[in-house]
């Protein structure tokens, strides 16, 4: 179903963005890129 494909794709994109910020902070010490509290 196309909705499911879109949801999976967005979820994967969202995870990759979050992981990029995480890696920058924990393996790159780029603290300015930390995720702020909601």
């Amino acid at each position: 179903h196309s909705d499911g494909i879109f949801t999976d794709s967005y979820s994967r994109y969202r995870k990759q963005m979050a992981v990029k910020k995480y890696l920058a902070a924990v393996l790159g010490k780029r603290y300015k890129q930390r995720v702020k509290n909601k």
Partner: antibody, heavy 109, light 109 residues
Framework: QSVEESGGRLVTPGTPLTLTCTVS????????MTWVRQAPGKGLEWIGF?????DAYYASWAKGRFTISKTSTTVDLKITSPTTEDTATYFC??????WGQGTLVTVSS | AAVLTQTPSPVSAAVGGTVTINCQSS???????LAWFQQKPGQPPKLLIY???KLESGVPSRFSGSGSGTQFTLTISDLQCDDAATYYC??????????FGGGTEVVVK
Amino acid sequence: QSVEESGGRLVTPGTPLTLTCTVSGIDLNSYYMTWVRQAPGKGLEWIGFIDAGGDAYYASWAKGRFTISKTSTTVDLKITSPTTEDTATYFCARDLDLWGQGTLVTVSS
Amino acid sequence: AAVLTQTPSPVSAAVGGTVTINCQSSESVYGNYLAWFQQKPGQPPKLLIYEASKLESGVPSRFSGSGSGTQFTLTISDLQCDDAATYYCAGGDISEGVAFGGGTEVVVK
């Protein structure tokens, strides 16, 4: 600043188990918290992390097998349905530069 | 998912000597976010190097990291008895998070 894991024990396969990481002097609104495990005599295995906003992300092999959540001073790792392959020392780390001593989980029937 | 392969293991050298550990990734490490950890028996890992070549605060300058892309190296010069440990590389993988190498044991003669 310190990190300490607790909750590790002997459990039978399929019995859910929650490990707790208690932090002191660390603002969980400013750091990522990571869970890593190490089977006896083996290497390190990254499980996942939780961000400042409380969103958790997992290695693909760990998704569905583990759940990471947090309060203001603790970070929990729930092993949803342990198998013998989950026998390991579980480490919690602030970012990846401040680690606890780990807590041992043994899964056996 | 990236697979990190460490060579050689174990590696042995005399006090005052130099040890080189290689870490090869099956795919390019995201952002060159490659770290090196030291782990002694019964202890948690300790961060030595981050972003391939940057020395963590408090770590002796005898430890150095280099490399980019898929090939990385940890060099320990003026080897000390206290350096006897297992060393792990850990690389950034945007689909998986963090991938650890299998570890390299350093034996000091």
